[in-house]
């Protein structure tokens, strides 16, 4: 899986998960979350070249049809796959409210 | 949606589903499949602008995050979101057999 | 410069409907939690429904409640209000504000208004 | 919900100190309060909000203060510009709400 154990551990040119601090009030401008200040977001990048993590059908057929037509425009994507929650606590007012906010964070990649 | 109806009918730069006619024989290097010789694969590519067709929160907040960090390369990518199966005929031997594969046409986009 | 933009007030009969718009611009939108304030004829302020952009978190006045519906177009910079089972009390001057950052807070930019008015 | 009340009108000769007060159905803490002007057929504009807190734009004749209970917004040195309705608002707690607004007259 191109999760955090194999992307973090080797240096990958190809679609893997890649480490992202978003510092809330810096990166998107956001004052209303109190806490966390922050959190390790995630992100995909990387080539997709052939069948690489290739996730559907169509994308492994995408993958072939780039290695014998390599002047095509139409390769896969290197995109999450799986995300999870994050836990935030804000204020409406003065009264504190603890909210899940859903695919959060970037999990594990995949070439799609 | 970015579909057919959208994509083929607007000229757009951004991420959107364009066609792709693929021949099994010429593209793919595939001979075993009777019927159809090719079919209308399609896929996605275009840019992903600020919150463009964003596909989960995480796609939303790395959109935010690039607009206020531009420098950044955590950026969404054009992938496929619908899919659907293809059914084709193929020989073992002299019989014939239909199958449906799963996941080969691309119907729709999104920004994930 | 900061400006909010609202559209789509109108004369509408008693339980029917309309569309307002806000559209902003000079600002990132999405860092801004987003309200709809209301002012009758001749009346005081009323607070009406709020979001937060992104994560799409919204809260409504218990007298719009299961009638009016906020959105937000994070794409577009625009900001909506959806109004359903209209009634004459509803009749106001619409003005959208965003907040200086937390989620309830003081409103440092606000639109010129849209109109409203519900009678039969 | 927290009600705001505000005295209706308020007549001040024009230079004088123009003080408006708006006093909470319960305490909302000294950061929680925002007053607004707005003059006849325009939008409302932030004029003071926080602890002390002034607008940007806002000349330094404006300040606010806030014990929790009332909150007090006072114009040192009243303009004829000043003539508007002065709203208070509360956001310690939901929903916002808002003083009925005070009519000031420099006279």
């Known amino acids: 899986a191109l999760d955090a154990a194999y992307c973090f551990r080797n240096v990958q040119d190809n679609c893997c998960l890649r480490p992202l601090y978003i510092d809330f009030k810096r990166d998107l401008g956001w004052k209303w979350i109190h806490e966390p200040k922050g959190y390790n977001a995630n992100f995909c990048a990387g080539a997709c070249p052939y069948l690489w993590s290739s996730d559907t059908q169509h994308s492994r057929v995408l993958s072939l049809y780039n290695t014998i037509n390599p002047e095509a425009s139409a390769s896969p994507c290197c995109v999450s796959q799986d995300l999870e929650p994050l836990t935030i606590l804000y204020y409406i007012g003065k009264t504190p409210k603890i909210e899940q906010l859903s695919n959060m964070i970037v999990k594990s990649c995949k070439c799609s | 949606a970015l579909d057919a109806a959208y994509c083929f009918r607007n000229v757009q730069d951004n991420c959107c589903l364009r066609p792709l006619y693929i021949d099994f024989k010429r593209d793919l290097g595939w001979k075993w499949i009777h019927e159809p010789k090719g079919y209308n694969a399609n896929f996605c590519a275009g840019a992903c602008p600020y919150l463009w067709s964003s596909d989960t929160q995480h796609s939303r907040v790395l959109s935010l995050y690039n607009t206020i960090n531009p420098e950044a390369s955590a950026s969404p990518c054009c992938v496929s979101q619908d899919l659907e199966p293809l059914t084709i005929l193929y020989y073992i031997g002299k019989t014939p057999k239909i199958e449906q594969l799963s996941n080969m046409i691309v119907k729709s986009c999104k920004c994930s | 410069d900061v400006q909010l933009v609202e559209s789509g007030g109108d004369l509408v009969k008693p339980g029917g409907s309309l569309r307002l718009t806000c559209v902003a611009s000079g600002y990132t939108f999405s860092s801004n939690v987003m309200h709809w304030v209301r002012q009758a004829p001749g009346k005081g302020l009323q607070w009406v429904a709020y979001?937060?952009?992104?994560?799409?978190?919204?809260y409504y006045a218990d007298s719009v409640k299961g009638r009016f519906t906020i959105s937000i177009d994070n794409s577009k910079n625009t900001l909506y209000l959806q109004m359903n089972s209209l009634k004459t009390e509803d009749t106001a001057t619409y003005y959208c504000?965003?907040?200086?950052?937390?989620?309830?807070?003081?409103?440092?930019?606000w639109g010129q208004g849209t109109l409203v008015t519900v009678s039969s | 919900d927290i009600v705001l009340t505000q005295p209706p009108s308020l007549s001040v000769n024009l230079g004088q100190t123009a003080r408006i007060t708006c006093r909470a159905s319960q305490s909302l803490g000294s950061s929680y309060l925002a007053w607004y002007q707005q003059k006849p057929g325009q939008a409302p504009k932030l004029v003071t909000y926080?602890?002390?807190s002034r607008a940007p734009g806002i000349p330094d004749r404006f300040s606010g203060t806030n014990s929790g209970i009332t909150a007090t917004l006072t114009i040192s040195g009243a303009r004829a510009e000043d003539e508007a309705d002065y709203y208070c608002?509360?956001?310690?707690?939901?929903?916002?709400?808002f003083g009925q607004g005070t009519k000031l007259e420099i006279k």
């Open positions: 608002q509360q956001y310690a707690d939901s929903p916002i709400t």
């Open positions: 926080g602890a002390s």
């Open positions: 979001v937060i952009p992104i994560v799409d978190i919204a």
């Open positions: 504000a965003r907040t200086l950052g937390l989620v309830l807070d003081a409103m440092d930019y």
